[in-house]
Structures are given as structure tokens and as C-alpha cells.
Interface confidence: low
């Protein structure tokens, strides 16, 4: 915007906004006037009010620029001392409204500076964890998930630097996938696909468990909860569909309390679900222990 | 630099398996996912699916439900991808990729042509 | 799955020529959209991802934009070595899935 009589630019780091003093133009009106702050991009504009003193019917409003449309931040209502307003744009302008004399104008002093923008703050996964080093460009977020759930998406975000910065990518999910293999299994935990929430129909999904050299498997079933028709889990003795197995739910109608024991380092753990019904599925908690 | 080497072309009779090897050099392999992409001859790219090296978790494309297995060594910055019950439709050139840093499939191995024919 | 669907499937055009690839995915996948670049024999290149933000190293003549369910790759000015195929993704949902494609032939 070109300055007026009454409007005034601002362009570094930080700088002061005070209210007019002595203007050479006839102000048998009052005053409109301007102050345009603008700040490096990737920057916010943050407005400390220093002091403030207006006259009844005097209005001061705080715009933030550089969006679609103007975004309202604050009116004299809402400046009192030592509020502090911030633009999330790197722009920001004052409207400083007077009323005519012989009254004569109100008083304020506003301090404005320039901070850095930031990332949001990333969603936690359901069934997982974020840690963030910092929302600032150049931090990043590590996501992990609860045991038996898998990374789906990127496991490190980078707040990339931008006019409005921005994560590099999606925000991941936890998810209980259908099927996987698990090398080195020492401790852990394999769930179905949307536990603790009911499996989906047509499922087929394979596990392979596959302890460290030297050592086997103990399987706990902490939870097994199949519909009443043709859904079926079955636990091999072995690396592969072939394997016979030591667990069928056709066969048994109770649960082995004392879990399984694998006699190499190997569980092939298979879940099939019909086309009816569902129910909340399994979790089984798996450790390896020395032969 | 990042590097992604994979194994070398492989000739297969139907109903047969391949596994093709995708080694990582150049980065903390158990840092990133690694992704496996195909390309059938003259067809779109289709994503098979991942595995997250630090824990040997893997997600798979639902279409290939129970006929892939990809698996890591992480002691040799290897990926690798197996493939089952192999039918003519899947001759293809199998890439790996290392995914989601700034951009997904950010890069590729060299390619791997399996082709299956009787 | 989200379909991918680009146009045009393909495309003849000169050196200096100013060139738009269209994709269109069957749901808004909000901006999670990345192109890329494939020459006969080769790994595909990463040009374009987040709809718009240009990968390191690729040069500036190729530009993204785009939102909710239609984005589209522009080329400034053919050069020789951009003639090949270009792929579109979406990595909104998960599969992600490709376009088909779209060659770039020498008129």
C-alpha cells in the first residue's frame, strides 16, 4: 500500500506503532489512519500492547494480511496493557480511527517483532505416540505405535519451512495389519486387523513369529474372540502354512490357559474371517526363551 | 548418497516364488521404510507394499493378500521381497524404494524384470 | 482404493513448448499428490510432491498445483531430455495408488 497522510509502512524485524502526534494535514474529521507491518515470510507478526490510552468512540482494529482475507486478531475491547496479539501471516495491519476535534485523539504505544511460525502440533496416532523435537522448521516428529500395531505412513515428519510452515508428510497411523513377519521375536504382541474394535469380513491374514537363534516361543492368548460361523484361527508348529498345527478354534472349544510352545523358533499364526458376522478377533503376547 | 541395489533378473515357471533382494547403502537403513513398487509392460506403477526396518513390521497392498512376504536383514542393509504362487500377469519390473522423506519414493533401486512363463 | 486417472494418456509437443498434465483422483486426497517422471528403462524420478512443492535438484520449468480432486504438472518449456512418461500419486490413503500415465512424445 503507497502511505497516506495517515498510513505508514513497516518492514523490519520489530519496530514501534505509535498513535499520531503532529500531522500536517487538516484533521477537522478525525483521523483514519494505517500503520502495514510486514515481516520476512515463514515469519508471524506479534503485537504487544506497551500502553494504550483511547477516547470514547476511538476504535483501533489488528488484521492480519497475506491470506485469502483479512483475518480480525483484535479490537480496542480486546487491547488492553500488556495483551499481546499474533498474526499467523506475515502480515498484519493497524486501524487507528480518531474523532474530530476538539476532543483531539487518544493516545497508544504498540511494540510489534517478528517470530517464527510453526508446525501444528502433530495428531497422536490412536494406539501409538509422537514425540516432537521442536514445531519450529527444521524440527521434526518421530512417531511409534503400541505393540502388535504397525507404522502406516512416514515414521519421521520434518517441519518444512514455508510462508506457512508445513509437515513434509501426512500424519501416520497405528494399525493392527493383516498379517506380517516378525523377526527376532523376542517380546511382543500380535492383534487382528482393527482390534480392539471388531476384524472385517474376508479376512485372510498370515503371521510368521521367528525367535532369535537358539531360542523358542511361548504364546499367551490374552484375548480370542471369534464370530459363531466360519471364522477360524489356526497356530502352526512351523515357518509356513504346511506346518501342523498345535491350536485350531474348530477343534477347541477352550483356550490353552497355559499358552503354547513352539518346538523350533517358529509360530505361523492364521486368522480367516467369512463374510458375516465379526467380532473383536485376537491378541497374542509372544516371548522367546532360551531352549 | 542414498543407494539402492537390487538383485538381478529372474526367469520363473507359474505357481513358482521369487525373492529379490534390495540392498541400502548411503543412510540408517532402520531409519526408513523401504517400499516395493511394480511395473507389469506397459502398465501403471503399483505399490506392493512396505516394511519398517527397525522392527520387521510390514503392511501390504490388499490385492496381494497372502502371496507377499517382505522381509529385512538389518545386519546387511537388506530388503527383500518374495512373491508366491506366481502367475503370468505378475512378470513385472520390481523396484525398491525408500519412502517418505519430503517426497514418497524419494528413491529407487535399479529395477528387477521377474518374468513368469511356462 | 482411490483411483488415479491423468490426461491426456499421451502427448506430442516441441522443444519450447509450454505442456499441462492433468490428474484427476476419484476422492479429494487434500494435496497428498506427487509426480513423477519415467524415461524407457529406467527407475521413475521424484519431480513434484505435496501437489506443489518441487523436489531438490529438479529444475524450475516444472511447476504443480492443484487441490482437492484435480492437479495438474506444467512444464514452463520443453526441453529434449523431458521427453518420457509422467505418473501422478496419491498418498492420501493408503494403498497409494499411481495414474496411468501420461507419454510425452517429440512432435
Known amino acids: 500500500q503507497t502511505p497516506g497522510p495517515c498510513s505508514w509502512n513497516f518492514s523490519g524485524p520489530e519496530g514501534s506503532l505509535d498513535s499520531p502526534t503532529d500531522l500536517s494535514s487538516p484533521t477537522d474529521v478525525g483521523l483514519d489512519c494505517f500503520f502495514y507491518i510486514s515481516v520476512y515470510p515463514g515469519y508471524g507478526v506479534e503485537i504487544k500492547v506497551q500502553n494504550i490510552s483511547l477516547r470514547e468512540g476511538e476504535t483501533v482494529t489488528v488484521e492480519g494480511l497475506g491470506g485469502p482475507d483479512p483475518l480480525p486478531l483484535a479490537n480496542q475491547s480486546f487491547l488492553l496493557r500488556g495483551q499481546v496479539i499474533r498474526s499467523p501471516t506475515h502480515q498484519a495491519a493497524l486501524r487507528f480511527q480518531s474523532l474530530p476535534p476538539p476532543a483531539g485523539p487518544g493516545t497508544f504505544h504498540f511494540h510489534y517483532q517478528a517470530y517464527l511460525l510453526s508446525c501444528h502440533f502433530p495428531r497422536r496416532p490412536a494406539y501409538g505416540d509422537v514425540t516432537v523435537t521442536s514445531l519450529h522448521p527444521g524440527g521434526s516428529a518421530r512417531f511409534h505405535c503400541a505393540t502388535g500395531y504397525q507404522l502406516k505412513g512416514a515414521r519421521h515428519l520434518t517441519c518444512l519451512n514455508a510462508t506457512q510452515p508445513f509437515w513434509d508428510s501426512k500424519e501416520p497411523v497405528c494399525i493392527a495389519a493383516c498379517g506380517g513377519v516378525i523377526r527376532n521375536a523376542t517380546t511382543g504382541r500380535i492383534v487382528s486387523p482393527g482390534f480392539p474394535g471388531n476384524y472385517s469380513n474376508n479376512l485372510t491374514c498370515h503371521w510368521l513369529l521367528e525367535a532369535p537363534e537358539g531360542q523358542r516361543l511361548h504364546l499367551h492368548f490374552e484375548k480370542v474372540s471369534l464370530a459363531e460361523d466360519d471364522d477360524r484361527l489356526i497356530i502352526r508348529n512351523g515357518d509356513n502354512v504346511e506346518a501342523p498345527p498345535v491350536y485350531d478354534s474348530y477343534e477347541v472349544e477352550y483356550l490353552p490357559i497355559e499358552g503354547l510352545l513352539s518346538s523350533g523358533k517358529h509360530f505361523f499364526v492364521e486368522l480367516s474371517t467369512d463374510s458375516s458376522g465379526a467380532a473383536a478377533g485376537m491378541a497374542l503376547r509372544y516371548e522367546a526363551f532360551q531352549q | 548418497q542414498v543407494q539402492l541395489v537390487q538383485s538381478g533378473a529372474e526367469v520363473k515357471k507359474p505357481g513358482a516364488s521369487v525373492k529379490v533382494s534390495c540392498k541400502a547403502s548411503?543412510?540408517?537403513?532402520?531409519?526408513?521404510?523401504m517400499d516395493w513398487v511394480r511395473q507389469a509392460p506397459g502398465q501403471r506403477l503399483e505399490w506392493i507394499g512396505y516394511?519398517?526396518?527397525?522392527?520387521?513390521?510390514?503392511g501390504y497392498n490388499q490385492k496381494f493378500k497372502g502371496r507377499v512376504t517382505i522381509t529385512v536383514d538389518t545386519s546387511a542393509s537388506t530388503a527383500y521381497m518374495e512373491l508366491s504362487s506366481l502367475r503370468s500377469e505378475d512378470t513385472a519390473v520390481y523396484y525398491c524404494?525408500?519412502?517418505?522423506?519430503?517426497?514418497?519414493?524419494?528413491?529407487w533401486g535399479q529395477g528387477t524384470l521377474v518374468t513368469v512363463s511356462s | 482404493d482411490i483411483q488415479m486417472t491423468q490426461s491426456p494418456s499421451s502427448l506430442s509437443a516441441s522443444v519450447g513448448d509450454r505442456v499441462t498434465i492433468t490428474c484427476k483422483a476419484s476422492?479429494?486426497?487434500?494435496?497428498?499428490l506427487s509426480w513423477f517422471q519415467q524415461k524407457p528403462g529406467k527407475a521413475p524420478k521424484s519431480l513434484i510432491y505435496r501437489a506443489n512443492r518441487l523436489v531438490d535438484g529438479v529444475p524450475s520449468r516444472f511447476s504443480g498445483s492443484g487441490s482437492g480432486t484435480d492437479y495438474t504438472l506444467t512444464i514452463s518449456s520443453l526441453q529434449p531430455e523431458d521427453f518420457a512418461t509422467y505418473y501422478c500419486l496419491q498418498y492420501d490413503e493408503f494403498p497409494p495408488t499411481f495414474g496411468q500415465g501420461t507419454k510425452l512424445e517429440i512432435k
Open positions: 516394511i519398517y526396518p527397525d522392527n520387521g513390521g510390514a
Open positions: 548411503g543412510y540408517t537403513f532402520t531409519d526408513y521404510n
Open positions: 476422492q479429494d486426497i487434500n494435496s497428498y
Open positions: 524404494s525408500r519412502s517418505i522423506t519430503t517426497a514418497w519414493f524419494a528413491y
